[in-house]
């Protein structure tokens, strides 16, 4: 190899690289060394050049043109075929011609961003060029044609397409299989059809932040299953629907901040399983339900800072038993700190929990139970005035412990604390002052002797009457009653929750009178009037008294609506035959549901029950009782119960039972002169007619014939030899006739023959 | 003048229940914590349970968790503690005590004069 | 076997000063204030110091309390024959979630 050239003149060399930026030049320099590798020509003035000029440059694989006047992406002549980094950035280029990049055979990563390109059309970027990054951020792209990056598929990783003016992306945009980051940032895309990303199997991250979306079609993401990191920040979305996120099984990396979102819906998260982050800070939201976020058992991140939330469910978090982190910074859950218990349960692994700026006036000893691993939890920027004995005593692996507040009400319910603090070495990140009493306003917590802690009276109001819990007929008016007491003479305001929410426009009186055995004392009362109730006024109600040094909050009364049931359905009277099965039906409304109860004759132990014939079905108001015996008859009372009252309806269940003879009728001997009875004791419903016959013919009867009154007995007295014969019973009713015989022989009577021998 | 005055004390057999009061006087009682404190024959202090006013929360020693439950009523200014499967063991004066304040690590101020509970067989 | 850990006897003569350590951990002493209760043969127990060092009204100042870290103790300056009595020492323990008390120290006047 002969002597390495020398650098160009108008430029400066270190190793391969040439450094020819920043210096005017309007055009190539014209000695430029066959050894460059890495070219930079950026910051010049130059609007064309001469393909002429990259002849002799076999080496060169990175080109900086960027910061330069060129309208079009230039031919590097015989180095094109082996240039590999083309950085063409902030220049004045228009569009972009398959023909000027089909010569760059080796072309890995191409910047065009900062240009004026409007479009990209489908002969953009021809097959040949195995670009692997290619950035167009930064110009006015206002449409992207169907296809428009096919020609890259075999090899494009990353598409920067931030800073533009995109609209509207077609659906199944992009046919680039190996494409793994797609930057859609700062565009003015409105909605995401579904399947618009169909095509896109080995994306991992997809930005679309700062964009004016609205609407996630369902669908809107599905083909990503490789996808980790999704940003949707800064857009204008309202809910997260369920079906949008259908098939993101691999995302890891949700971001939604700054957007428009009211509510979480539970559906939907089912689809993202492998979740670990989730970002929904500063949105509107108002209220987390229960299991909202049920779904995402991995999920290891959630960020809910600077939204509306008031209302935290109990059981809101069931289900995230892999979250560490929980931001909830600059909300409105005072509520859920200074009463509710359980609106942490389910976070097993949390180790930090940030509450900074919630506007939490006091922490209930029961305002963090389910947190018991919990590490880091910050209350910063709270003008907390209270902390109960025992709020922070479960956490036994707390480590750091963010207190900011001068607004501490230092009596003898706070005492506990600064020995805590310091015995956990807690305090490190504690700046607590008192405002209340006046002789230590401005003092901190740990320098105030223990024997300053005293409750010489009562600032924070004490409740002393609770509402209680009631049961109310639909349409009637009820009351709820809560009284406080309180030492201080700082205005009290009332409030209601139902259901941990505040009633927001209450009926309520309220009124204040001094305290009976205490005459320095001040009694305050609130009554809540609801007016002609309905089911809409279940639930728990609560009040809320609240002055200067604190809120107390009520017990949770209860109340249940009821409506006295009525029947849809009533017992009929039936008449069936024995052994066949008998139905009846009996249904009731009422709030709460009423039970059905059967009893028979006035009692619960009857035959069909005893014998196990009965049977209940709950769903369809059907009481069977199969395999129908005569006992069954009687009069079945349907009874429907529920908290408001009883009713009943009966119906009469009648046995049909075809005659039948209970003892035998059997043959007879007597003798002339004697009584015979015969017996045709016959059973049947309805009790059946009996009729004698004599032999073919019904018998006639002689004043020495008598009957019972229902024939069921025959007694023939003076008995004649002539009474001898066939006797037949036939009992009737409308089922059918039954038959019985009986043989009556007649002998002499008896008396001595001669022989000495009786007769008889 | 505050007073506490226990009740309720007595022979019980092994396995049986029985339940003390203590009923309070000479100040809020719904405003202070209660607890209950025993003393076996010849041995020392033992806390056995105690309850927060307002809440009623609860907190009891290992040794009775499950079998002694405290319980107050306010409006009668009474306490309560509610023995059962009782053990030779739980032989003690049992003594009713109130807390300087509401919470429960507050110290205790005044005590009752105790009730004896023997379980024998 | 109690949790605060006290002598079982102490003893002094009319006069001397006589002192009653009690020993605990960090989830008791050393996180909550120490009480000192005297009592009397055949009687109730009586609060004596409170808050690791005062005295309610009418406990005379002869009796004193103080704690450094997991430790308290209780002096009895002056000591008198009335002072014949079972001293505890008592406080919270957060572990527990539960009041303990000392085992006891018997005070004898010789």
């Known amino acids: 190899a002969g002597p390495r050239a020398p650098c160009a003149a108008a430029c400066t060399c270190a190793g391969d690289s040439l450094d020819c930026g920043g210096r005017g030049l309007a055009a190539l320099p014209g000695d430029l060394p066959s050894w460059t590798r890495s070219l930079n020509l950026s910051y010049n003035k130059l609007s064309e050049i001469d393909p002429a000029g990259f002849e002799d440059l076999p080496n060169l694989q990175e080109v900086y043109l960027n910061n330069n006047e060129l309208t079009a992406v230039p031919s590097l002549g015989a180095a094109s075929s082996h240039v590999v980094s083309l950085f063409l950035q902030h220049n004045k280029i228009r569009s972009v011609e398959g023909s000027q990049l089909k010569a760059y055979l080796s072309l890995e990563v191409l910047d065009l961003s900062l240009n004026n390109i409007t479009e990209v059309r489908n002969t953009c970027f021809p097959h040949g060029p195995p670009i692997k990054e290619l950035n167009l951020a930064g110009n006015r792209i206002g449409t992207l044609e169907l296809g428009a990056f096919d020609g890259l598929s075999r090899s494009l990783l990353t598409l920067r397409l931030s800073k533009n003016r995109i609209t509207q992306l077609p659906v199944r945009a992009f046919k680039l299989p190996r494409l793994t980051q797609l930057d859609l940032n700062r565009n003015r895309i409105r909605l995401i059809e579904g399947l618009t990303f169909q095509g896109l199997n080995s994306l991992e991250v997809l930005k679309l932040q700062r964009n004016n979306i609205s609407k996630l079609t369902d669908g809107a993401f599905w083909g990503l299953s490789k996808m980790h990191v999704l940003h949707l920040e800064y857009n204008s979305l309202v809910e997260v629907n369920s079906g949008s996120l259908y098939g993101l099984t691999a995302l890891h990396q949700l971001h939604l901040s700054n957007n428009s979102i009211a509510r979480i819906h539970r559906k939907g998260w089912s689809f993202c399983q492998k979740l670990h982050e989730l970002v929904l800070s500063f949105n509107n939201l108002t209220r987390l339900d229960e299991e909202s976020l049920a779904e995402l058992s991995s999920l290891s991140v959630l960020r809910l800072s600077h939204n509306s939330i008031s209302h935290i469910a109990e059981g809101a978090f069931k289900g995230l038993r892999s979250l560490r982190v929980l931001d909830l910074d600059h909300n409105e859950i005072s509520g859920t700190i200074e009463d509710t218990s359980g609106a942490f349960s389910g976070l097993d692994s949390l180790s930090k929990l940030t509450l900074f700026g919630n506007k939490i006036k006091s922490v209930a000893k029961r305002a963090f139970s389910g947190l018991e691993g919990l590490e880091h939890l910050n209350l910063g920027g709270n003008a907390i005035r209270s902390v109960q004995f025992d709020a922070f005593v479960k956490m036994k692996n707390l480590k750091e412990l963010h207190i900011s507040s001068d607004s501490f009400l230092c009596d003898c319910q706070l005492k506990w604390l600064p020995p805590w603090l310091i015995g956990r070495m807690l305090q490190a990140f504690v700046t607590a002052t008192c405002a209340h009493p006046e002789s230590l306003k401005g003092q901190s917590i740990f320098s105030v002797p223990p024997e300053s802690f005293v409750c010489d009276d009562f600032l924070k109001p004490q409740i002393i009457t609770q509402p209680e819990t009631t049961m109310a007929m639909v349409g009637k008016d009820i009351r709820f009653t809560c009284s406080a007491a309180s030492s201080s003479s700082s205005p009290m305001t009332f409030a209601w929750k139902k259901d941990n929410e505040v009633l927001t426009n209450a009926d309520m009186e309220n009124f204040v009178h001094v305290h009976a055995q205490d005459g320095e004392v001040m009694e305050y009362t609130t009554i809540l009037h609801l007016r002609q109730v309905t089911f809409g006024h279940e639930g728990r109600y609560q009040c809320v008294i609240t002055n200067h040094f604190g809120s107390t909050y009520s017990h949770k009364a209860r109340l249940t609506v009821n409506v006295l049931p009525s029947f849809t359905k009533t017992p009929h009277d039936i008449t069936i035959r024995t052994t066949t099965m008998a139905r009846l039906e009996c249904a009731a409304t009422g709030h709460p549901n009423p039970q059905i109860a059967w009893q028979k004759d006035g009692g619960t132990d009857f035959p069909a029950a005893r014998e196990r014939r009965m049977h209940v079905m709950p769903d369809d108001d059907v009481f069977f009782i199969t395999d129908v015996k005569i006992d069954d008859a009687g009069v079945y009372s349907c009874t429907a119960q529920n908290s408001a009252g009883s009713i009943s309806a009966n119906a009469t269940l009648t046995v049909l039972e075809t005659p039948s003879l209970v003892v035998p009728l059997e043959d007879r001997v007597v003798s002339v002169g004697e009584t015979v009875a015969l017996q045709c004791k016959a059973t049947g419903n309805p009790p059946p007619r009996i009729t004698w016959f004599k032999g073919d013919r019904p018998l006639s009867l002689t004043e020495r014939h008598h009957l019972t009154p229902d024939n069921q007995l025959l007694v023939v007295q003076n008995v004649v030899a002539e009474d001898a014969g066939r006797y037949t019973c036939e009992m009737s009713n409308t089922l059918g006739t039954e038959r019985a015989h009986s043989q009556l022989s007649v002998l002499p009577a008896a008396g001595c023959r001669k022989d000495g021998t009786t007769v008889g | 003048e505050v007073q506490l005055l226990e009740s309720g004390g007595g022979l019980v057999q092994p396995g049986g229940s029985l339940r003390l009061s203590c009923a309070a006087s000479?100040?809020?009682?719904?405003?202070?914590?209660m607890s209950w404190v025993r003393q076996a024959p010849g041995k020392g202090l033992e806390w056995v349970s105690g309850i927060s006013p307002g809440d009623s929360s609860t907190y009891y020693a290992d040794s009775v968790k499950g079998r002694f439950t405290i319980s107050r009523d306010n409006s009668k200014n009474t306490l309560y503690l509610q023995m059962n499967s009782l053990r030779a063991e739980d032989t003690a004066v049992y003594y009713c005590a109130k807390g300087l304040y509401s919470n429960p690590n507050e110290p205790f101020d005044y005590w009752g004069q105790g009730t004896l509970v023997t379980v024998s067989s | 076997q109690s949790v605060l850990t006290q002598p079982p006897s102490a003893s002094g003569t009319p006069g001397q000063r006589v002192t009653i350590s009690c020993t605990g951990s960090?989830?008791?002493?050393?996180?909550?204030?120490v009480s000192w209760y005297q009592q009397l043969p055949g009687t109730a127990p009586k609060l004596l110091i409170y808050?690791?060092?005062q005295r309610p009204s009418g406990v005379p100042d002869r009796f004193s309390g103080s704690k450094s870290g997991t430790s308290a103790s209780l002096a009895i300056s002056g000591l008198r024959s009335e002072d014949e009595a079972d001293y505890y020492c008592?406080?919270?323990?957060?572990?527990?979630?539960?009041?303990?008390f000392g085992g006891g120290t018997k005070l004898t006047v010789l």
């Open positions: 000479g100040f809020t009682f719904s405003n202070y914590y």
């Open positions: 008592g406080t919270w323990d957060y572990s527990l979630n539960g009041y303990v």
């Open positions: 960090s989830s008791n002493i050393g996180s909550n204030y």
């Open positions: 808050d690791d060092s």
